[in-house]
């Protein structure tokens, strides 16, 4: 079971001091009140990769 | 079979305390976050507190922050309601009850509720 | 916090009616949504969660729906042991967790 600041939770996610572990970001679209949505950028990662510059 | 036992109601006169406690059973208790709801004679549910799988994080319904305190004991599956500075509208059956495992979803075991009585 | 209201506050009915129960929100809280059963000197009882799934064990005359601020849990065909008190609770403004001032259905 991680801990806060030990390793971070893995891209896309967030710790939940709440639930003791990482949750997806992506549901802080719908319920943004979650405390692990603190942890999260403002702005959700790109569907996919540029192919170019 | 999952079990919540409540303990530790009566009847206490204002400005008093009590310590309620929830021995849990029958599922591993320490991975579940852990909620405090009460009811009114008569009345509906109310949600009093909420504690995480680990005891570090805590919250409370701004009726009772600052008097209550919500507690576990991961180790003896039990979890504990500190109620201090008590109040005749603290007066309620007090149910304890076991959090889905995602986030504040729903509570999907109650124990079966202690009764709190305030009065002189 | 988010106030949950529930309509009728209570209802007259038979068995093997159909009944529906509805909850409103003050505010949208997607389907964060969930509903319960109460009988006299009991503890309440999880039906359905995130407003249509029906909690494990739970008989299938009972139904949700709803998203946003409008709900609806149905009794497809009302059973004794169905005569209760219902209650909506959301779960969207956490940790202000609501639930609605119930709903007793009792026999005609």
């Known amino acids: 079971e991680q801990a806060p600041g030990t390793a971070p939770c893995s891209h896309g996610s967030s710790w939940s001091a709440d639930l003791d572990k990482c949750m997806d970001c992506a549901s802080c679209r719908a319920r943004p009140h979650s405390d692990f949505c603190l942890g999260c950028s403002a702005a959700p990662p790109a569907p996919f990769r540029l192919l170019w510059p | 079979e999952v079990q919540l036992l409540e303990s530790g109601g009566g009847l206490v006169q204002p400005g008093g305390s009590l310590r309620l406690s929830c021995a849990a059973s029958?599922?591993?208790?320490?991975?579940?976050?852990m909620m405090w709801v009460r009811q009114a004679p008569g009345k509906g549910l109310e949600w009093v507190s909420y504690?995480?799988?680990?005891?570090?994080?805590?919250h409370y319904a701004d009726s009772v922050k600052g008097r209550f305190t919500i507690s576990r004991d991961n180790s003896k599956n039990t979890l504990y309601l500190q109620m201090n500075s008590l109040r005749a509208e603290d007066t309620a059956v007090y149910y304890c009850?076991?959090?889905?495992?995602?986030?504040?979803?729903?509570?999907?075991?109650w124990g079966q509720g202690t009764l709190v009585t305030v009065s002189s | 916090d988010i106030q949950m209201t529930q309509s009728p506050s209570s209802l007259s009915a038979s068995v093997g009616d159909r009944v529906t129960i509805t909850c409103r929100a003050s505010?949208?809280?997607?389907?964060?949504l969930n509903w319960y059963q109460q009988k006299p000197g009991k503890a309440p009882k999880l039906l359905i969660y995130a407003a249509s799934s029906l909690q494990s064990g739970v008989p299938s005359r009972f139904s949700g729906s709803g998203s946003g601020t409008d709900f609806t849990l149905t009794i497809s065909s009302l059973q004794p042991e169905d005569f209760a008190t219902y209650y909506c609770?959301?779960?969207?403004?956490?940790?202000?967790?609501?639930f609605g001032q119930g709903t007793k259905v009792e026999i005609k």
């Open positions: 029958g599922f591993t208790f320490s991975p579940y976050p």
């Open positions: 609770q959301q779960s969207y403004s956490t940790p202000g967790i609501t």
């Open positions: 009850a076991r959090g889905g495992d995602t986030y504040f979803d729903y509570f999907d075991y």
């Open positions: 504690i995480s799988p680990s005891g570090g994080s805590t």
């Open positions: 505010q949208s809280i997607s389907s964060y």
